[in-house]
């Protein structure tokens, strides 16, 4: 049988290292070997690349090396299959090297912020050194803030006469850093270097981006004043790196600013004490380069009525997210508070919040939750200056099997009948949401009997059992994960009924 | 047997033209680039003109240049050389000759390498340009 | 165009007896594209070395090529009677490709 015709020839010239061809099929079923004629210097020169020793024989590739490499040059190829059954020559190709130049990557040396200019990095290179010095080259720099997978790219071509191999990067995030890659190519060719060896420069420091502010309104005090717990955090798209030196707090009543109060402080948390009416609150964070824009809350009146606009709420778990959903019966509310904290039986520790717009829903990383941990979420609409009143659900981004059965004791006992209760297991210790609860119960050398029952009844009475008869029982509490044994405790029917 | 068989020679005056043939046989044509190689009586050889494997040009000898032109037909085996603008320092024997891929002594590396050389010459045809 | 400047121009040796000509390019020429031929009398030229040192097929090794550049140099080891023609180098490299004038050689 004939070889295989040679077909999908790709050549791509190494500038100053070789010209190389592939070609299909790779492998044929017989020895096969190939020879790959080549016309250069436009026409005037031929020759041949040949992998018929035998260590190569089924090679699908050839290369020509130096110095029988011309440029600029036209090349002609044909491929030619020879078994022992005969030859099969491929189609003639034609290859412009400059439009299948690959040259060696660029090398970048710095990238570094230009003193007073905000918002840019200058990058230098080194052009390859290995790469035709009267051709232009195209540039691809990619880019990416330090913690972010996702890489930019901007396209930019250098004429070789320019000699200065930089480039400004503007319209960067401030005091940011940013990891750079280069790659180019000749301009007209169709195949880029490698990438450059990633450099990283950070853009000049500014005054801070701006704040998220929120708050907690806590129930009023026995003398009338209202704590209300203010938080704030840089806000969405600051600069990573920002530092603040600290915060200036304002705030007054409605319509009465002489009665301004002022707090300066270092931390990213304040608790006011205010009085019934509405007051407004404003806080800037400042750095030695200036302050941050203002940051405005509305802290609505004691007896101000506020509205209500979700109408339910969903919290479901993707592959590596909580997702929460909600629906609303006002269109015209497109910002949202997230609230989110581990319900704990003590004071929660930790307490999360986060501004969503133009969208109901959010999503969180699972693992920036805590597994087996059940987490209040609430969600807030926000119309203006307005806040509306909270929508919550429960969650948990893993759940397992109770850390502890329920505590169970045997009260009213009878001649036949028993009457059982048992304590909720604490927060810290369900580990998931308690779905029901199962009485497993037994005579002594008798049959074990069960009965299921909802996770809200915490009491249980059985009936016929039989008199005078030792009995052992235990609750099992179950999760979506299983279920954990409480304490086994024994009891004995009455032989007479006690009235 | 490889033979090269060239034909059309003839006397010509001075600006006419003259087309040479050469028949090649017993091997494969289409892998083998062609020349045409001239001897003016009793001097050396002139390279002429050649054409390659791929059917582009080689190129022309500066003293035919613009006035010769050299093709090949594949499907015939046969090269052809097109003289017109005939001139009295034309007249010669033309050759017709294979250019054939000859490996070197190994370079190294992977592959094995071949250049193509004239290694088959033809009889020749004489061309006359007198008035 | 590189013009091949061959010396002598002719060469008359005894039977046994070493042969050299030389080839001088007017710039250099790579040693992958010179070659040598022989055209005996009244015959047509045969190819005789290629890639300034490479024996075509059939040929003796009584001949041998160097060089590389702009000299190139033919030997003959021994000199026989079939030896006598005109001896032409050629260069392949630049275009056009052109010849040397030739060495005629003899047989004392």
């Known amino acids: 049988v004939l070889p295989a015709k040679p077909e999908n020839i790709s050549c791509i010239f190494y500038y100053e290292e070789n010209f190389t061809c592939t070609w299909s099929p790779e492998k044929e079923a017989s020895y096969t070997w190939y020879k790959v004629k080549r016309t250069y210097s436009y026409g005037y020169k031929s020759d041949i690349c040949s992998t018929d020793n035998s260590t190569r024989g089924n090679h699908a590739s050839c290369s020509f090396l130096p110095p029988t490499i011309t440029n600029p040059d036209n090349y002609t190829i044909q491929v030619e299959a020879q078994n022992a059954d005969g030859i099969m020559k491929s189609d003639i190709t034609y290859w412009n090297l400059d439009a299948i130049m690959k040259i060696e990557p660029p090398e970048i040396f710095s990238v570094k912020s230009v003193l007073g200019i905000k918002r840019m990095l200058q990058i230098k290179w080194i052009r390859p050194v290995l790469a035709p010095h009267s051709s232009t080259l195209k540039y691809t720099l990619r880019f990416r803030t330090i913690n972010s997978a996702y890489w930019m790219e901007v396209n930019f071509t250098k004429e070789d006469i320019d000699r200065d191999e930089t480039y400004n990067l503007t319209e960067l995030q401030a005091f940011t850093e940013y990891v750079m890659t280069l790659r180019c190519a000749p301009a007209e060719s169709m195949f880029w270097s490698g990438w450059s060896q990633e450099k990283v420069g950070t853009t000049e420091e500014e005054a801070p981006y701006g704040l998220d502010l929120w708050r907690v309104l806590k129930p009023a005090m026995v003398d009338g004043r209202r704590p209300v717990q203010l938080m704030w955090k840089k806000a969405t798209g600051a600069p990573v790196l920002e530092k603040a030196l600290g915060y200036n707090i304002w705030y007054f009543p409605e319509n009465n600013t002489n009665l301004t109060e002022t707090v300066n402080t270092t931390n990213q948390t304040h608790e006011l004490y205010l009085g019934g009416k509405t007051y407004w609150v404003y806080v800037v964070s400042y750095n030695s380069l200036g302050e941050s824009p203002v940051a405005t809350l509305r802290i609505p009146a004691l007896n101000e009525k506020t509205f209500q606009c979700i109408e339910a709420m969903q919290a479901c778990l993707t592959q590596d997210q909580l997702v929460v959903e909600w629906q609303s019966s006002a269109p015209e509310v497109d910002t949202w508070m997230v609230e989110w904290f581990p319900d704990v039986d003590s004071e929660p520790s930790s307490f999360s919040w986060e501004s969503v717009s133009q969208a109901r829903n959010w999503t969180i990383q699972k693992d920036e939750l805590k597994p087996l941990w059940c987490y209040n979420i609430s969600v807030y609409p926000v119309l203006r200056d307005r806040v509306g009143q909270p929508y919550s659900t429960q969650a948990y981004v893993q759940e397992g099997i109770p850390s502890a059965g329920p505590v169970t004791q045997a009260d009213s006992i009878g001649v036949k009948t028993v009457t059982i209760t048992w304590k909720e297991i604490p927060k810290s210790k369900r580990n998931g949401f308690i779905k029901n609860y199962t009485i497993f119960y037994q005579a002594e050398d008798g049959k074990e009997f069960s009965k299921t029952v909802n996770s809200n009844i915490l009491q249980y009475r059985l009936e016929s059992l039989t008199r005078r008869t030792s009995y052992s029982l235990q609750v099992m509490a179950s999760t979506n994960a299983g279920g954990t044994n409480g304490t086994k405790i024994n009891f004995k029917t009455l032989s007479i009924s006690v009235l | 047997e490889v033979q090269l068989v060239e034909s059309g020679g003839d006397l010509v005056k001075p600006g006419g033209s003259l087309r040479l043939s050469c028949v090649a046989s017993?091997?494969?044509?289409?892998?083998?680039?062609m020349s045409w190689v001239r001897q003016a009586p009793g001097k050396g050889l002139q390279w002429v003109s050649g054409i390659n494997w791929a059917g582009g040009t080689i190129g022309y000898a500066d003293a035919v240049k613009g006035r010769f032109t050299i093709s090949r037909d594949n499907a015939r085996n046969t090269v052809y050389l097109q003289m017109n603008s005939l001139r009295a320092e034309d007249t010669a024997v033309y050759y017709c000759a294979r250019e054939s891929p000859l490996r070197l002594g190994d370079l190294g590396g992977d592959y094995f390498y071949y250049y193509y050389y004239i290694d088959v010459w033809g009889q020749g045809t004489l061309v006359t340009v007198s008035s | 165009e590189v013009v091949m400047i061959q010396t002598p121009l002719s060469l008359s040796v005894s039977p046994g007896e070493p042969a050299s000509i030389s080839c001088r390019a007017s710039?250099?020429?790579?040693?992958?594209?010179l070659v040598w031929y022989l055209q005996k009398p009244g015959q047509s030229p045969q190819l005789l070395i290629y890639g300034t040192s490479s024996r075509a097929t059939g040929v003796s090794d009584r001949f041998s090529g160097s060089g590389s550049g702009t000299d190139f140099t033919l030997r003959i080891s021994r000199v026989e009677a079939e030896d006598v023609g005109v001896y032409y180098c050629?260069?392949?490299?630049?275009?056009?490709?052109?010849f040397g004038q030739g060495t005629k050689v003899e047989i004392k």
């Open positions: 710039q250099s020429v790579s040693s992958r594209y």
């Open positions: 017993g091997f494969t044509f289409d892998d083998y680039g």
């Open positions: 050629q260069q392949y490299d630049n275009s056009p490709r052109t």
